[in-house]
């Protein structure tokens, strides 16, 4: 298989020239680094901050949408060390880690008016902010918390460059005073779990003070990674030695505690995933080690299987793991160059950004009972990094995804096996992201994100689909690089997608094309199961060609057909003529073959010999519907392009046209009549229709109406029965 | 930049008052609590007392609670600490502080800014 290439489709968006300014202002001021991140919520925001400046762009346009300047308490300005996105009583914000002279701030920034409005000292020196929860009280809500937790409201898990574990009273409760951050409230530090939190945050609150419990002291060793896993209720801590801690925040005790494979490497980012059906309450978490700018060169994917013995559907909808049973390292990867084939020795490799994606089948598409705890059918992971190799100017970087349900079915192995690459992987897939570098550079990449909604396999090119059709190497999706000067827009496009393009472009050499085409698409899995163990050789070019138009209509590729019959047309290549009666004698076979399998498939819903339609049969009756319809955007491009045609073919292309229309329209209302259940038809007519598939006023009201209308304009001449 | 520079400490005899005294700067005392921490020799940093922005709410350590007041001038800019029957066991270092991390015996952990400092000696 060939590399798969990430294309640009955007030029640079840039920042403002305010925003570039003011990021600009203190780079010459050696703590002060620029650091840049998507914001993980829905908001579409990324954040940028560089010394005691923080601007807040839209992650799409690039457009400012926030910015601040934050003020220190003595001659040295703070510096901006940690941004996480928070949302709280219909407020959107950001929690705010400041670096100070002494110590540190916790701030809760609202991005509606740009301002701080609360503030609270910390110890030491802040690495990482997660939001644990955005309110508080004994609700329903906050049951999965440990009892003293839920007096507080709002809480923020903070952690520090000598190792404390501090959880922190947002003290969301009183927002009556507007703090800015040189007005930062004190804080009081709670070692144990005591028994009367209610009435000591009372006390404590009086006194102008936020409460927090300590569940790590100072060790020494700093935190290098922060999250909290909603679903299985732990704060997963990464620590700068390759340690990795999970804490539950319903016992407030550490679960697990183990040194990656890597070794004294820190763990650098944590992102959880859980598979489709998994009977043993099994999900994961992936921990990444990365020496990341600093001395060394490692950057390895660690997967880390969680057991739990139970999971549960909250009322809220929300799925809960509990009762760790086991956590074990299941598989590894290392991205340090040897996994795929590198030209030059690599010198430094960064993680630049990392992110899960899941997606839940639709409703009615679900057989599950209805308080059943529903699991993503789709579970990916996607990893970008950037490799710099000794003596080249620009580095590379590569996007990965792994998609657990296909690892699953590869048998869960616990690495690449011998002579496997990444980019031959049937559970991970790599993209080269080569188009980006050589469009954005020299400007850095600070971080890479995803959009969810826009990742998709496309349309099965056939029923089953093969077995390529499910690889991750078969995914289509948008994102989005956040650089130090704006935003670019990246398509990446399977193999599948990107085969289908490249037929596209062929045009009118397609002749000559013809083999090369054929072998893509049996590759990328786009061909009939039929063709997969038939020899190329023994099949003629026509029947090559039939199963690349084949593959072209099952995908809905039909720009590709369509633009194929537009040049032939206008082009007038040697071989046009026929290509265009070969195609039209094709498409118009295919109308006929469809027709009948649709016809044989409707048999029951007529013949009163069923009740109900199995998923599968509707499937197919849809994929018919699907080919008809394409079909017939085919003949109306002929119809419509047609030239220099005598009248005898310009009748005959019509009615082609004209009948698969109305075949079409056809399929359309019978697939309607079986969404509304009324169809199939039973013989026993007294069976009462669950609920009327139809509006009856509003049809009555409709018709009323244009009888009125008809007798109207026939002057009492119509009549109406 | 905010500053806080302490004066008013001194010797004194055991059962004598003292009146201490935090000139603040750079920052609105309306907006802000401020505290007095001290350290007596070979100690750590103890909390003493402190007044919140809105100057009605104060609090003390139960080791001095009745003996000292704290109050503020906004006018002047300053917050005071009145000493009425001092102990031996009162003698230290004292600080004007803001942005305190403390544990719940109150002993201090660290400070976000401080003075330099005013000496307090009880001795008879």
């Known amino acids: 298989m060939r590399d798969l290439r990430a294309q640009v489709t955007s030029g640079l968006l840039p920042f403002p020239e305010v925003t570039l300014q003011a990021l600009g202002e203190d780079e010459i001021t050696l703590e002060s680094v620029l650091r840049g991140k998507f914001a993980a919520g829905k908001n579409g925001l990324a954040c940028l901050a560089c010394g005691p400046q923080l601007e807040v762009v839209n992650s799409i346009t690039g457009e400012r949408l926030s910015a601040y300047r934050f003020s220190g308490v003595n001659e040295q300005p703070p510096v901006v060390l940690a941004v996480k996105e928070f949302s709280w009583q219909k407020r959107t914000g950001l929690l705010i880690g400041l670096e100070e002279t002494e110590g540190s701030v916790l701030c809760l920034y609202d991005l509606g008016i740009s301002k701080v409005v609360k503030a609270v000292v910390l110890p030491g020196r802040v690495t990482a902010i997660e939001p644990i929860i955005n309110h508080g009280g004994a609700s329903a809500s906050t049951q999965h918390l440990h009892p003293s937790l839920r007096w507080l409201f709002g809480v923020a898990a903070v952690v520090t460059d000598v190792g404390q574990i501090l959880l922190v009273d947002l003290c969301l409760d009183d927002l009556s005073c507007n703090q800015n951050e040189v007005e930062a409230s004190d804080l009081e530090v709670l070692t144990g779990i005591p028994a009367e939190v209610p009435h000591i945050r009372e006390s404590v609150m009086r006194q102008g003070r936020h409460l927090c419990f300590q569940l790590v002291s100072p060790t020494g060793t700093a935190v290098s990674t922060l999250s909290y896993i909603s679903r299985t209720n732990q704060l997963a801590v990464g620590f700068s030695d390759g340690y990795l801690a999970l804490w539950n925040m319903k016992s407030m005790k550490r679960e697990y505690y183990i040194q990656l494979e890597s070794g004294q490497v820190p763990v650098y980012a944590v992102t959880f995933q859980e598979p489709e059906n998994d009977p043993r309450n099994c999900c994961y978490l992936w921990a990444v080690q990365s020496t990341q700018d600093s001395e060394g060169d490692v950057l390895s994917l660690h997967l880390l299987q969680l057991a739990f013995g139970n999971r549960k559907c909250l009322a809220s909808g929300q799925i809960l793991y509990e009762g760790l049973e086991y956590c074990e390292e299941r598989y590894t990867l290392d991205l340090t160059g040897g996994m795929f084939p590198l030209r030059g020795q690599t010198s430094n490799t960064k993680l630049l950004g990392c992110q899960s994606i899941e997606k839940f089948r639709s409703h009615g598409d679900r057989e599950e009972g209805v308080n059943e705890a529903l699991s993503p059918d789709t579970s990916v992971s996607v990893f970008t990094w950037q490799v710099n190799i000794y003596g080249q100017g620009k580095p590379s970087v590569y996007l990965g995804l792994f998609d657990i349900n296909r690892w699953y079915h590869a048998q869960m192995p616990d690495s690449l096996r011998s002579g496997e690459y990444l980019h031959n992987c049937s559970y991970f897939a790599l993209w080269s992201l080569e188009s980006v570098v050589s469009r954005t550079s020299p400007h850095g990449i600070l971080d890479i994100l995803v959009h969810e909604r826009s990742l998709n396999r496309g349309v099965p090119p056939s029923y089953p689909p093969p077995e390529q059709f499910f690889n991750p190497s078969t995914y289509n999706f948008d994102a989005t690089c956040l650089l130090n000067s704006g935003v670019v827009h990246l398509t990446c496009t399977g193999f599948q997608k990107e085969t289908l393009t490249f037929l596209k472009k062929s045009g009118p050499s397609l002749n000559e094309l013809i083999p090369d085409g054929y072998n893509r698409c049996l590759v990328a899995g786009l061909l009939s199961p039929r063709f997969v163990d038939v020899q190329p050789s023994s099949l003629s070019q026509e029947e090559q060609l039939e199963a690349i138009l084949s593959a072209a209509i099952q995908t809905s590729s039909l720009g590709l057909l369509t633009g194929y019959i537009r040049r032939w047309i206008t082009e007038e290549q040697p071989n046009s003529a026929t290509n265009l009666r070969f195609v039209l004698e094709w498409t118009w076979n295919k109308v006929v073959l469809t027709k009948e399998e649709f016809d044989r498939l409707c048999v029951p819903l007529f013949d009163g010999s069923c009740h109900f339609m199995d998923p599968q049969t509707i499937q197919s009756i849809q994929q018919c519907y699907l080919l008809l319809s394409n079909l017939n955007i085919v003949l109306s491009c002929f119809a419509s392009e047609a030239r220099e045609i005598t009248e005898r073919g310009l009748i005959d292309l019509s009615n082609k046209f004209v009948v698969s229309h109305l075949i079409c329209q056809y399929a359309q209302v019978v697939l309607w009549f079986s969404h509304s259940g009324l169809l199939p038809e039973g013989i026993d007519d007294s069976v009462q229709l669950s609920r009327l598939c139809y509006n009856y006023p509003v049809i009555q009201n409709y018709y009323t109406s244009r009888r009125q209308k008809f007798e109207r304009l026939s002057r009492g001449k119509w009549n109406p029965d | 930049q905010v500053q806080l520079v302490e004066s008013g400490g001194g010797l004194v005899q055991p059962g004598g008052s003292l009146r201490l005294s935090c000139a603040v700067s750079?920052?609105?005392?309306?907006?802000?609590?401020v505290s007095w921490i001290r350290q007596a020799p070979g100690r750590g940093l103890e909390w003493v007392s402190k007044i919140l922005n809105n100057g009605t709410n104060t609090a003390y350590a139960a080791s001095v609670k009745g003996r000292f007041t704290i109050s503020r001038d906004n006018a002047k800019n300053t917050v005071y600490l009145q000493m009425n029957n001092l102990k031996s066991e009162d003698t230290a270092m004292y600080y004007c502080?803001?942005?305190?991390?403390?544990?719940?015996?109150?002993?201090?952990?660290?400070?976000?800014?401080r003075g330099q400092g005013t000496q307090v000696t009880v001795s008879s």
């Open positions: 750079g920052v609105d005392l309306s907006r802000v609590g």
């Open positions: 502080a803001q942005g305190l991390v403390q544990d719940s015996q109150g002993l201090v952990l660290s400070s976000r800014i």
